[in-house]
Interface confidence: low
C-alpha cells in the first residue's frame, strides 16, 4: 500500500544533528532462516579458486569480528588438481557497513563505517597486455 | 588487545535499554581509498562463474540500495567458452549488517538486522553422491 | 532506457474533461508506484496525485480532489490522469513521474525518472 | 501556498558556495527526509537528492545536503555555470497526505 505517514510512537530527535545522528537498537535481528552457508558450505576448499578464512579483530568495531577471504594461489585448479596460471584466483570484494566506536572507547557512541571485505574467490580470464 | 578505559568524553547514556540502544552517526567514514572493487571491476563478466548484479531497494533499510550477484549458469564457463555443467556455479554468501527503521516509518530510530547477500560467484567441483 | 512519454495535452473549455497518458518502458512499471505533477506557466512544481504499484491506493492533492481520477494498466504500461470539471487554474505542464523504489514506498527514493511532459490549457 | 518555504532566490560567483533552506513543519520535514530537485529552464526536473543525503548515480558530490528539525538545506559547494536552475526540496506531508514541493529557489551563477 501507500508509504504510512510517520509512526506516532517515533522517538523525538532534539539532536542538531538530526537525522545524521540516529538511535539503534543492537539487539540484531536475524532476517537468515538458515546459519550463514559462508561458514556451514565448504565452497573455500572446493572452489578453482580455493581460499583460506583469517580472522580480523578490532574491538573498536561493531561487529568486532570479521573473516577475510584471502585466494591461495595465483592461478586457478584445473582438472588434474594442478594450478594453471593461464587463469586467475581473483578476491571478490564487498563494502560492508560496520559500526565505529566515536569517541575512542565509549560504549554507547558509534560513526557508522564503511570497509572493505574479500568474501571469496572466483577464477577469472587475466587480461592480457599485448606489446607492440 | 587490552580493554582500554572509558573515554571520559563519551555521550552519558540514562537509557533504560543501554547498551542495547545507542547513537549512531550517519556521516559514514569510507576507509576505503580506493573505488568499490566490486563496481570497478569486471570480475562479474571474466569468472569462470559470471554472474548478474541485481538492484535490491527498500527505504525502510540504510543502506537503501543493496546489489545482489545472481550465476548466470548452473555450469562453469571451460576453455572453449561453453558451459561445463561437471562442474558448479555457486554463489558466495556474506552476512551483512543494515540498519531497519523501528518504528517503521520513522527516520531517526533504527535496528541493526543481519541479512544475506550474495556476493559474486565462484565455480567448485559438484559433490557426486554414490548410490549403492 | 528508462523512459516515461505523457500524451494528451491540449486546449480544452473550462468545465470540460480530458484524459492524459503516459507511456512506460525501459523497467517494470508494475513494480513502481507513480505520480503525476504539474507546473503552471512562470511556476513552480505542484504534486497532483500518486498511484500505488498495483493500482491499490491512490493520493491526491487538494486542489484536484474528487474532479481527477488517477489510474494505472500495468498490462500496457500506462498510468492515466483522468481529469473532469477543468478549471483555468488547472493550465499547467502535466508530468508523470516514477518513484526511485520498487514497492510500497512513494517518497524515501524521490522520483527519479520523468517524462517531458504534457501542456493542458484550459480556457473559453 | 506551499507546505515547504524556500527563498526566491540564490547566487554566487563560480566556484563560490551557495546554500539553499527550505522549512516546514512537524508534518512533513519533521517527519520525513528531504529529497532535492533541480530544474534547468524548458527541461522536466532531475532528482538531485534523496533519503539520508544519498545522491543518484551522475549527480556530483558537489552537492549536500543537511537536515534538522522542521528545515533542510541544500548546499551547492563549487558553483559552476551549469548549476543555473530552479531548486525545490519536496517530502511527504502527513496532515496532506501527500506529497509536497517547496516554492523553489532559483540559483544565478554571477
Known amino acids: 500500500g501507500i508509504t504510512i505517514p510517520r509512526n506516532p510512537g517515533c522517538p523525538n530527535s532534539e539532536d542538531k544533528n538530526f537525522p545524521r545522528t540516529v538511535m539503534v537498537n543492537l539487539n540484531i535481528h536475524n532476517r537468515n532462516t538458515n546459519t550463514n552457508p559462508k561458514r556451514s558450505s565448504d565452497y573455500y576448499n572446493r572452489s578453482t579458486s580455493p581460499w583460506n578464512l583469517h580472522r580480523n579483530e578490532d574491538p573498536e568495531r561493531y561487529p568486532s569480528v570479521i573473516w577475510e577471504a584471502k585466494c591461495r594461489h595465483l592461478g586457478c585448479i584445473n582438472a588434474d588438481g594442478n594450478v594453471d596460471y593461464h587463469m586467475n584466483s581473483v578476491p571478490i570484494q564487498q563494502e560492508i557497513l560496520v559500526l565505529r566506536r566515536e569517541p575512542p572507547h565509549c560504549p554507547n557512541s558509534f560513526r557508522l563505517e564503511k570497509i572493505l571485505v574479500s568474501v571469496g574467490c572466483t577464477c577469472v580470464t587475466p587480461i592480457v597486455h599485448h606489446v607492440a | 588487545g587490552i580493554t582500554i578505559p572509558r573515554n571520559p568524553g563519551c555521550p552519558n547514556s540514562e537509557d533504560k535499554n543501554f547498551p542495547r540502544t545507542v547513537m549512531v552517526n550517519l556521516n559514514i567514514h569510507n576507509r576505503n581509498t580506493n573505488t568499490n572493487p566490486k563496481r570497478s571491476s569486471d570480475y562479474y563478466n571474466r569468472s569462470t562463474s559470471p554472474w548478474n548484479l541485481h538492484r535490491n531497494e527498500d527505504p525502510e533499510r540504510y543502506p537503501s540500495v543493496i546489489w545482489e550477484a545472481k550465476c548466470r549458469h548452473l555450469g562453469c564457463i571451460n576453455a572453449d567458452g561453453n558451459v561445463d555443467y561437471h562442474m558448479n556455479s555457486v554463489p558466495i554468501q556474506q552476512e551483512i549488517l543494515v540498519l531497519r527503521r523501528e518504528p517503521p516509518h520513522c527516520p531517526n530510530s533504527f535496528r541493526l538486522e543481519k541479512i544475506l547477500v550474495s556476493v559474486g560467484c565462484t565455480c567448485v567441483t559438484p559433490i557426486v553422491h554414490h548410490v549403492a | 532506457e528508462v523512459q516515461l512519454l505523457e500524451s494528451g495535452g491540449g486546449v480544452v473549455q473550462p468545465g470540460r474533461s480530458l484524459r492524459l497518458s503516459c507511456a512506460a518502458s525501459?523497467?517494470?512499471?508494475?513494480?513502481?508506484?507513480m505520480h503525476w505533477v504539474r507546473q503552471a506557466p512562470g511556476k513552480g512544481l505542484e504534486w497532483v496525485a500518486v498511484?500505488?504499484?498495483?493500482?491499490?491506493?491512490?493520493y491526491y492533492a487538494d486542489s484536484v480532489k474528487g474532479r481527477f481520477t488517477i489510474s494505472r494498466d500495468n498490462s500496457k504500461n500506462t498510468l492515466y490522469l483522468e481529469m473532469n470539471s477543468l478549471r483555468p487554474e488547472d493550465t499547467a505542464v502535466y508530468y508523470c513521474a516514477k518513484v526511485g523504489a520498487s514497492g510500497d514506498y512513494y517518497y524515501s527514493y524521490g522520483l527519479d525518472v520523468w517524462g517531458q511532459g504534457t501542456t493542458v490549457t484550459v480556457s473559453s | 501556498q506551499s507546505g515547504l518555504t524556500q527563498p526566491p532566490s540564490a547566487s554566487g560567483t563560480p566556484g563560490q558556495t551557495v546554500s539553499i533552506s527550505c522549512s516546514g513543519s512537524n508534518s512533513n520535514i519533521g517527519s520525513h527526509s528531504v529529497n532535492w530537485y533541480q530544474q534547468v529552464p524548458g527541461a522536466a526536473p532531475k532528482l538531485l537528492m534523496y533519503g539520508i543525503g544519498q545522491r543518484p548515480s551522475g549527480v556530483p558530490d558537489r552537492f549536500s545536503v543537511s537536515q534538522s528539525g522542521t528545515s533542510a538545506s541544500l548546499a551547492i559547494s563549487g558553483l559552476q555555470s551549469e548549476d543555473e536552475a530552479d531548486y525545490y526540496c519536496a517530502t511527504w506531508d502527513d496532515s496532506l497526505g501527500g506529497y509536497v514541493f517547496g516554492s523553489g529557489t532559483k540559483v544565478t551563477v554571477l
Open positions: 525501459g523497467f517494470i512499471f508494475s513494480n513502481y508506484g
Open positions: 498511484i500505488s504499484y498495483d493500482g491499490s491506493n491512490k
